[in-house]
């Protein structure tokens, strides 16, 4: 077995992609490795080539089908193997049974847009991408707004504990440039984690009307 300095971590995007990262201290950067996926109840299997992302880690995406196709279900178990080339043969480095719906990480929300903006508030909407219909409404969101002179890390998190693909930001400052991001997470799954943050949406509040208290 590979020693404790190795890690093999994968997530399922709920539709047709399993993304994997394999890391091993002391492994050669030019080693040729791949991930094989063998579902227990499907006729297909899939392979991806691990490509270096840092000094000691490699990543790849198992593309299981068309982006919006439902390739796995809650009862599937996928056996994932890391194989590395040693001379003319492949050596198995790690074997993991993977329950896809216990290891979810969705795609970042897309199509962010300003629905309506005023001096002190802004209504923003977005869409989820490549998310399984199995979730129905069992999703939650986190959002954050970047104010002038602050960093994303300083931005307070707004939690939406339901499938709500819009938000009304309030108590904003007039005539001020902001940026907004949102991420999504299904409620199910032992190792389910937040999606990446969406691309930032830039918007500007309207200036206060002259001579009026808004």
């Amino acid at each position: 077995a590979v020693n404790g300095t190795s890690q093999f971590t994968c997530f399922y995007n709920s539709r047709a992609n399993i993304s994997c990262v394999w890391s091993q201290d002391g492994a050669l950067q030019d080693t040729s490795c791949q991930v094989h996926a063998w579902p227990d109840r499907r006729r297909w299997n899939q392979t991806c080539e691990l490509l270096p992302v840092s000094q000691a880690s490699w990543a790849c995406n198992l593309i299981l089908g068309a982006p919006d196709s439902q390739k796995l279900t809650t009862v599937d178990i996928v056996t994932l193997r890391v194989l590395c080339r040693e001379g003319v043969r492949w050596r198995v480095m790690a074997i993991q049974d993977f329950k896809p719906f216990e290891n979810l990480r969705l795609m970042a929300p897309i199509s962010l847009q300003v629905v309506h903006v005023e001096t002190h508030r802004c209504n923003i909407s977005w869409e989820i991408s490549q998310a399984s219909h199995y979730f129905e409404r069992h999703l939650e969101f986190e959002a954050r707004t970047l104010s002038p002179g602050h960093t994303w890390e300083e931005a307070p998190l707004l939690t939406l504990k339901q499938k709500q693909e819009w938000i009304c930001l309030e108590t904003l400052t007039p005539d001020t440039q902001y940026e907004f991001q949102v991420r999504v997470k299904p409620l199910q799954g032992e190792f389910t984690t937040w999606s990446p943050w969406s691309q930032p949406l830039a918007f500007r509040t309207k200036p206060a009307a002259l001579g009026k208290d808004t």
Partner: nanobody
């Protein structure tokens, strides 16, 4: 804390199958990661498989070559090891183990990572 009792060992012919069970009592089973290890005569105890608290990830020793399947039933407080296409080199005492600390299921744990052990069950594979 839990107590562990293995069962299902015995004599089996090469190429055959065997299912080991490990029943837990006296604790909250779902709060433990569970593992299987084995020890052949004159050899060190070696890792076979380990599964996370909810069973979402299970790691297997490369030596199992995909012949073994580890699963757990938290409703029955039991973890299983299904051994298919067994070989004479699978002959060993098989131990079930529980781990109180968090296990991500992304790496191979050492036997020292597990705090609670069963008494073991003998598996003998004849050629």
């Amino acid at each position: 804390e839990v107590q562990l009792v293995e069962s299902g060992g015995g004599l089996v012919q090469a190429g055959g199958s065997l299912r080991l069970s490990c029943a837990a009592s006296g604790g909250t089973f779902s709060s433990y990661a569970m593992g299987w290890f084995r020890q052949a005569p004159g050899k060190e105890r070696e890792f076979v498989a380990a599964t996370t608290r909810g069973g979402g990830r299970t790691m297997y020793a490369v030596s199992t070559e995909g012949r073994f399947t580890c699963s757990r039933d938290n409703a029955k407080n039991t973890v299983y090891l299904l051994m298919n296409r067994v070989k004479p080199e699978d002959t060993a005492v098989y131990y079930c183990a529980a781990r109180t600390s968090y296990y991500s299921g992304t790496y191979y744990p050492a036997s020292s990572d597990f705090d609670i052990w069963g008494q073991g069950t003998q598996v003998t594979v004849s050629s």
